[in-house]
Interface confidence: medium
């Protein structure tokens, strides 16, 4: 025997109080799949959260963070304060990276500079709190008329969130 509720599409719920008629989700609620007996309350993006996508009858609202903050957790469940490049976030706020470490992003932790000598290369540009060391070519790699070394752009995956 087929469940009559299975005919109710997304955006509706199966109303037991009305002979299992499909009723539209009330305002500020949604159902993303068919056959649901209740609609879920829409997420509200308040305070440090801002609305990235409005709630509809078939999908929940999506939040991101106000400027100066970034998302943490699945579906941006938390907002965390940004820091400046060259810093990492601590309980007492943003703290400069310790000597020998750097952070080229507004989030995340400080991490160690490249050790050029391990690769047998000279230091072309010293590291800072916000930038990694840039290594030059190995001495044997230098040939007359060789073009100057361009510091590489910081490696970063586009749009990659901490999840």
């Amino acid at each position: 025997l087929q469940d009559p509720c299975s005919n109710c599409p997304a955006g509706t719920f199966c109303d037991n109080n009305r002979n299992q008629i499909c009723s539209p989700c009330p305002p500020n609620s949604f159902s993303s799949a068919g056959g649901q007996r209740t609609c879920d309350i829409c997420r509200q993006c308040k305070g440090v959260f801002r609305t990235r996508k409005e709630c509809s009858s078939t999908s929940n609202a999506e939040c991101d963070c106000t400027p100066g903050f970034h998302c943490l957790g699945a579906g941006c469940s938390m907002c965390e304060q940004d820091c400046k490049q060259g810093q990492e976030l601590t309980k007492k706020g943003c703290k400069d990276c310790c000597f020998g470490t750097f952070n080229d992003q507004k989030r995340g932790i400080c991490r160690p500079w490249t050790n050029c000598s391990l690769a047998g290369k000279p230091v072309l540009m010293n590291g800072t709190k916000a930038r990694d060391v840039v290594c030059g070519p190995r001495p044997a790699d230098l040939s007359p008329g060789a073009s100057s070394v361009t510091p590489p752009a910081p490696a970063r995956e586009p749009g990659h969130s901490p999840q």
């Epitope: 000597f99 470490t101 932790i109 400080c110 995956e157």
Partner: antibody, heavy 117, light 112 residues
Framework: QSVEESGGRLVTPGTPLTLTCTVS????????VTWVRQPPGKGLEWIGV?????ATAFATWAKGRFTMSKNSTTVALKVTSPTTEDTATYFC??????????????WGQGTLVTVSS | DIVMTQTPSSVSAAVGGTVTINCQAS??????LSWYQQKLGQPPKLLIY???TLESGVPSRFKGSGSGTEYTLTISDLESDDAATYYC??????????????FGGGTGVVVK
């Protein structure tokens, strides 16, 4: 996406041993890789981490006892002069991404190293 | 280096019950704390990072809290599948403490 350890075997004390972590489905350009070990019946011990730029950091007890290096798809952990206390399962793990290298969300199954004379 | 002291070393509770595991750092680690679950013969599995952020796919029965030097993992509505050893792990960076990561000693959870 996966990481897989290899190279674990029975070695005699003092014989250098290199373990390899082979990654697939992602690029080491964007991730840090951590090595963790677990002696039989004991807890987890953090050994060290290698970052996207090749820089490494080691636990104080591990400095001088291990070295780490990498290429495009593998990370190598060398146990320079193993002792019986280095008998353990060795895990490699990928950080969530390079900025968030404080935690690891992709782990290998581990490779067993036994140091015995 | 900092030291992470995890208590208790083992705990037993009934299905449906609640278990609390504590982790104390020897200095302020600014919520850079993760919790892992490890079952026998398996690698660790990330549950929580940044002290309280639930990893994707982990049930909300697992809850992390704390700040400064004191952190807690609470497992509510215990299921038999939760029987495992749980570890905390911290990151630290400072001119005195140095730079690195460290695990707590682990807590074995038995579900009756």
């Amino acid at each position: 996406q996966s990481v897989e350890e290899s190279g674990g075997r029975l070695v005699t004390p003092g014989t250098p041993l290199t373990l390899t972590c082979t990654v697939s489905g992602f690029s080491l350009t964007y991730y840090a890789v951590t090595w963790v070990r677990q002696p039989p019946g004991k807890g987890l011990e953090w050994i060290g981490v290698i970052y996207d730029n090749g820089a490494t950091a080691f636990a104080t007890w591990a400095k001088g006892r291990f070295t780490m290096s990498k290429n495009s798809t593998t990370v190598a952990l060398k146990v320079t002069s193993p002792t019986t206390e280095d008998t353990a399962t060795y895990f490699c793990a990928r950080s969530a991404n390079n900025a968030w290298s404080t935690y690891s969300n992709l782990w290998g199954q581990g490779t067993l190293v036994t140091v015995s004379s | 280096d900092i030291v992470m002291t995890q208590t208790p070393s083992s705990v037993s509770a009934a299905v449906g019950g609640t278990v609390t595991i504590n982790c104390q750092a020897s200095e302020d680690i600014s919520s850079y704390l993760s919790w892992y679950q490890q079952k026998l013969g398996q690698p660790p599995k990330l549950l929580i990072y940044k002290a309280s952020t639930l990893e994707s796919g982990v049930p909300s029965r697992f809850k992390g809290s704390g700040s400064g030097t004191e952190y807690t993992l609470t497992i509510s509505d215990l299921e038999s599948d939760d029987a495992a050893t749980y570890y905390c792990q911290s990151y630290y960076s400072g001119s005195i403490s140095g730079y690195g990561f460290v695990f707590g000693g682990g807590t074995g959870v038995v579900v009756k």
